[in-house]
Structure formats: structure tokens, C-alpha cells
Amino acid sequence: DSSKWVFEHPETLYAWEGACVWIPCTYRALDGDLESFILFHNPEYNKNTSKFDGTRLYESTKDGKVPSEQKRVQFLGDKNKNCTLSIHPVHLNDSGQLGLRMESKTEKWMERIHLNVSERPFPPHIQLPPEIQESQEVTLTCLLNFSCYGYPIQLQWLLEGVPMRQAAVTSTSLTIKSVFTRSELKFSPQWSHHGKIVTCQLQDADGKFLSNDTVQLNVKHTPKLEIKVTPSDAIVREGDSVTMTCEVSSSNPEYTTVSWLKDGTSLKKQNTFTLNLREVTKDQSGKYCCQVSNDVGPGRSEEVFLQVQYAPEPSTVQILHSPAVEGSQVEFLCMSLANPLPTNYTWYHNGKEMQGRTEEKVHIPKILPWHAGTYSCVAENILGTGQRGPGAELDVQYPPKKVTTVIQNPMPIREGDTVTLSCNYNSSNPSVTRYEWKPHGAWEEPSLGVLKIQNVGWDNTTIACAACNSWCSWASPVALNVQYAPRDVRVRKIKPLSEIHSGNSVSLQCDFSSSHPKEVQFFWEKNGRLLGKESQLNFDSISPEDAGSYSCWVNNSIGQTASKAWTLEVLYAPRRLRVSMSPGDQVMEGKSATLTCESDANPPVSHYTWFDWNNQSLPYHSQKLRLEPVKVQHSGAYWCQGTNSVGKGRSPLSTLTVYYSPETIGRR
């Protein structure tokens, strides 16, 4: 039952004389294990014997013994799955059909495999993509329908007979599906590879040549161009002629169109391989190339830089930066179109040639006001000297210069005057827009830069102004030197340091805090009476009569100032004591009599003592002694004593006469 035998193996195997064949093979005998295996070469079925005739290359018996001549052929299989075979070496006459006769206990099967052995190693086969374009990576494949474990081989790639630098990837297959050796090479062909021969060479393990396959590369590429120019350096002067020729060194496929480009832009009506430029102008300077197209795309030549030389054009000056702030740095750049580039420059400031400045740039590290003005330049090259352009204006900005505060008033200024000051400056850029004044006051500014101080104070010492544009510049302060009458005049007691007692030596000082002008005169006055003209008023021995209200005056050429009235107080013991009697010194008995102790004392009497004609002190201590009712016995002489902090004083005797009333006399 043939359906029970299933085989898998390559249909045909290829080799050459002296190589080997490895035949991968699998099978399935469904009714049991393999008992007998014979490998026939070109088997023929004999109907008479119902057996196969042919050369027996290999035979296995039930006892597993193999005849010695069968060493060349090896069955590498097993009794139920593997039927792999090896023939090593293989010979030319091994070509044909191999028959694998398989027998199990109950079934038989003949499996046929084709073997193709050539006399010499057969060539590999190179496979190329359908189209190859320059710079596009392609894979070249070299395939050989051969692989055998006992016979190592290698595939090498050559370009024009020279081994290729690119690394190839070699793979082998020895499976029931296929037997081959393959080499793959990744390669980015360039246009120059077009028409070149690529070879895949089969070599043995020692690198000995066995066979090869060759192909000619057909690399599609854009046209490759060469540009030639007359004159060869492409440097001409205005009015000269120039010829450019475009040559196609390679194109695949053939080219179709030609054009010329200048600075990347196509030139109209220029569709031949020669470009003629007659009487060139400087505008024709630039980068020229030719462009030729084919089906792959456009190809461009290298660029030719055509330089049309001319004398410098009128120059312009660029200033970095204007306006410039004083002290900053500034650079001038002379710009002039010229070919070749200018080699020499002449600079002008306000129309005057600046000596020593011959470079394209003028650098000023620290700008000063005098640098301001118009700068122009002239450029020069081998073809001539350009013209001076309009120039550029350098504006140098700086704070107001030489600022001064000026007093407009006639001098001297007196306290209370109206003072006018002006703020002056020498120069300023930009213009002064405002002014500042120090110190600040409630003063009016009738016009810009003018300050009016009404009723100027004695203490307005200095004033400074600032003139301001973008910056403020302060003037040195100016002294107003205001003249005024002496100030803060006051009387000051110099001695004694303590309170003034009668008899003391006393000195009073007339003080003042300030005076302008400094030259002063003094006057002392008491109750409108002039006492002296010195700064001090002296009393050798002060008396109570000197007490009173004193003033001093200090005057200068501006005016005079009086002190506040100063009270001079003299302390003294009670004096001029006397006893006064009321209603009189003769009083009728029974009436009332009042005795008063009058005195002159400073400070006032604090304590009184009364005495009678016997110098007996009476038990009374107030200023008044009241006798009520008065008796005749009260008649007699009385005196009093007054005491203050300075001392004591006593009065003379005063006699009180008390007479009898008419009633008393009537009773007598």
C-alpha cells in the first residue's frame, strides 16, 4: 500500500566530479520499522523477477552489516524517520537516478532522487534587481545549487577583477526543501560603476578558483558634466568676453535637454552646450553651471565662479551705533561694492581727510563729543578709486557740560531780598529739557533754568543746580552769602554762678548766635537808659537798686537785634524796717490797734518777730500785730525783726500811746 510511505527530499541534487553529495531525506513507514534498505543507481524494475535491477551503491541487511566497498556511500538515516544519504567523493558516473528501496515487515517502496554530477564545478548564478540607479542601495545575490558538509566552498565578489570592499553575507541550506549556497552583497553603485563587470567566484576552502559568473552593471544615472571656461580662471574685467562649454562625460540613459544656470536660476534661451557672454558687466558676476537632463533626472556641472572685476562703487558709511553715548565705543564701516575687494580706504571727517586711517573699519574705543560729525570714505582697488558717498552722521550724546549756577542779583544779598539764580551750561546733546535745584524749597521757577527765591532766608547758604537732558550734570554749589542782622540775641549771666546777693560782683554777657557781616556793636539798656557799649555789663558790687529789667542790642551794617528783657534780681536781707500803727500811734482804750512790720527784702520776709519796750519777744510771728481791745497797759515802745533766707533786719522803736476813755475818766 504505497500511500503508507511519505518521503521528503530535494527533487534533484547537483555536484561535480570529486565533490560530495549530501542528500537530506525524511520518510514515514506507517506499518512499522524499516527492515531492509538498498540504494540503487538507475534502478530498472524487472517484471519477470518482480525485483529491481541496477547498481547497488549501498545495502543494509537485517543484521546491519555493510560491505566494505560501500564506504563511499553512507546511509545516515534510521529505521523510521531519517533517510539522509552522503556520497563522498561523488563521480561523474554517479549522475542519474538514485533509487531508495525500502522494505518493512509487510510493505516495500522505491523512492527516486535525481543526481546531476558535472565534469567540472558548475558556475554560480548572479541575480540583479531589475533596475539599478546611482546611489541607491541594491542587493547583489550569487546563488549556487550546491552544499555538502564534506566539501567546504566559498563565494567571492569581484568588481573589475578586484575584490569588493563591501562585506557579503553567505548562507547555506541543506534541508529536505532545498540545497544551496548563497552570497548577498549590499552595494550602493555610483555612476562610475556603469558598464563595469561584477564577478561571483566559486572557490574551494583553500581559495582555489573553481568557477564564476559575471554580469555587466547597468547603472542608471543623471548626466555627468564637465564645464570649461575661457579664460580658465574666470576672472575678467567689465567689457571682456567669456565662453563656457559643457561636456557630457557620461549619461545613462541618453540625455534629452541642456540648460545653463546662474546663481541657481535658469538663463533663458541658453540651450546649447556653449554659453557665450559678450561684453560682460559686473552684474554678470556669479556662479554658473550647466544642467543636462535624462530620464533619471537633471545633472549639474560644478560651479564656475565668474568674477567680473570693476573699480569700487560710491561708498557708504555704516555707523555702529549712532547716536552714541560719550565714553561708549563706535565702529565705522566703509561699504563699497568692488571686485577685487578694496585694498585701501581714505576716511573723511566733516570733509577733511583723516590721516593714518586706511582700513575698512575705524574703531573708536571711547567716543568724545568732538568725534561727532559727518564721516565719509573712499575705497580703492587695483582697477581704480571709487567716489565718496554721502557719508553718515555720528551723533554723540553727552550730559550737559560746564554747568554753573549764577546769581543774578547785585551783591550782597540781604535777608528778605528776592534772589534770582540761573543755571547755565556750555553745551548739551540732546538739548537740556529740565533743571533741578538743591536744596529743594517752595521756590518759583519763572522760566526754564531760572530760580526765584522770594524773601530769602538768612540760612540759605548754598544753592546748586543741575541741567538735565537724558542725564543730569550738577554745578558746584554757589554760596548765596546772605547778609542779615545778628540773630538770637540774649542776655546771659556769667557771674556769679549762683543767685545774686547784694554786694556781689556781677557780669552779664550779651550773646548772639550769628551775624553776617561779623562786625557788630553792643548796647546795654535799663528802662530805656543806655548803660554801656561792650559785650559785657559788669557790676563791682551790686545793690538792690541795680535790680530791674535789662536788654542788650547787637547791631551790624544790616540791622540791629534786641534781646528779650532780662530781669536782674538782687537778693538782700530785710532792710528799712519800721513799725506802722493803725489807726495811729495814739489809740483810745477799748479800741483796736494794728501794728504792721514794714520792710524791704528780697526774697520777702518769711518770719517776723515782735518785741516790746523791754525787748521781750511777743508770741506773735506774723507781719501784723493786732491788739483788740487795746488797753492802757499796752502803751509803750514796740519794734519788729524780719528774717528771710539772706538774713535779719530790725526796726527802730515805735511808741504806741493808749489813753483812757471818757467812761474810765468819768468813773474816776
Partner: nanobody, 122 residues
Framework: EVQLVESGGGSVQSGGSLRLSCAAS????????LAWFRQAPGKERERVAT???????SYADSVKGRFTISQDNTKNTLYLEMNTLKPEDTAMYYC????????????????WGQGTQVTVSS
């Protein structure tokens, strides 16, 4: 007040050398030009060489390669080194100064020295 005093003039044979000095005092300009001028009898005063405060130098074509202008700021002195002297270099040599750029015309210079005579005989 700026004062310029020249020295170093004298008589020399053709091909000889001289060194002129100019002592400057009272100079307070920020940004200035110092120059040497010369005046031959009966001729206009002409610029010989200039140097500005940034060190930029310029020479008259007739003296290029033979004369060298220099300044010593520490000594406030201007120099003119004159080599390969020719009879046509005979003139009174003046030191001049101005605040600002160096110009070629003598009228642009506000300060002048009294001059020093250079005589070159053949």
C-alpha cells in the same frame, strides 16, 4: 596752555640720519593728533607725518620708508627718526598738535613749536 619745543635739528650729509624730538606740555586733550610739518624757503608748509592718540600713523609719500614717527607717552615726547636724508629734505621742521583726528592741512593745527632747522648737503 599747550607748549611744544622741538630739538635735534642740524646739518648732515646726504644719506645721513637725524632724530628730532618735540617735548609737549600742558596737553590735556582726550583724543589728539601730533604731527611733524616742514617748510623749505619759499615753499608751502607741508605735512611730513602724523600720529594720533590711538597710535595710527600716516606719512607723506616723499618720506615713506625713510622717516619714522613715534611717541613716548611717559615722557610726553614726539620723535621723528629721519634716515637716508636727501638735500630736498632741507627745511625748518615744526611739531604741531590739535585735539581730534589727524588732518593733512596745516591750518587745522592750533598748537605749534618754534621749529628746528634741518640742512642736508650733497
Amino acid at each position: 596752555e599747550v607748549q611744544l619745543v622741538e630739538s635735534g635739528g642740524g646739518s648732515v650729509q646726504s644719506g645721513g640720519s637725524l632724530r628730532l624730538s618735540c617735548a609737549a606740555s600742558g596737553y590735556t586733550y582726550r583724543g589728539y593728533c601730533l604731527a611733524w610739518f616742514r617748510q623749505a624757503p619759499g615753499k608751502e608748509r607741508e605735512r611730513v607725518a602724523t600720529i594720533d592718540s590711538d597710535g595710527y600713523i600716516s606719512y607723506a609719500d616723499s618720506v615713506k620708508g625713510r622717516f619714522t614717527i613715534s611717541q613716548d607717552n611717559t615722557k610726553n615726547t614726539l620723535y621723528l627718526e629721519m634716515n637716508t636724508l636727501k638735500p630736498e629734505d632741507t627745511a625748518m621742521y615744526y611739531c604741531a598738535a590739535r585735539g581730534g583726528w589727524c588732518y593733512s592741512l596745516s591750518k587745522e593745527y592750533n598748537y605749534w613749536g618754534q621749529g628746528t632747522q634741518v640742512t642736508v648737503s650733497s
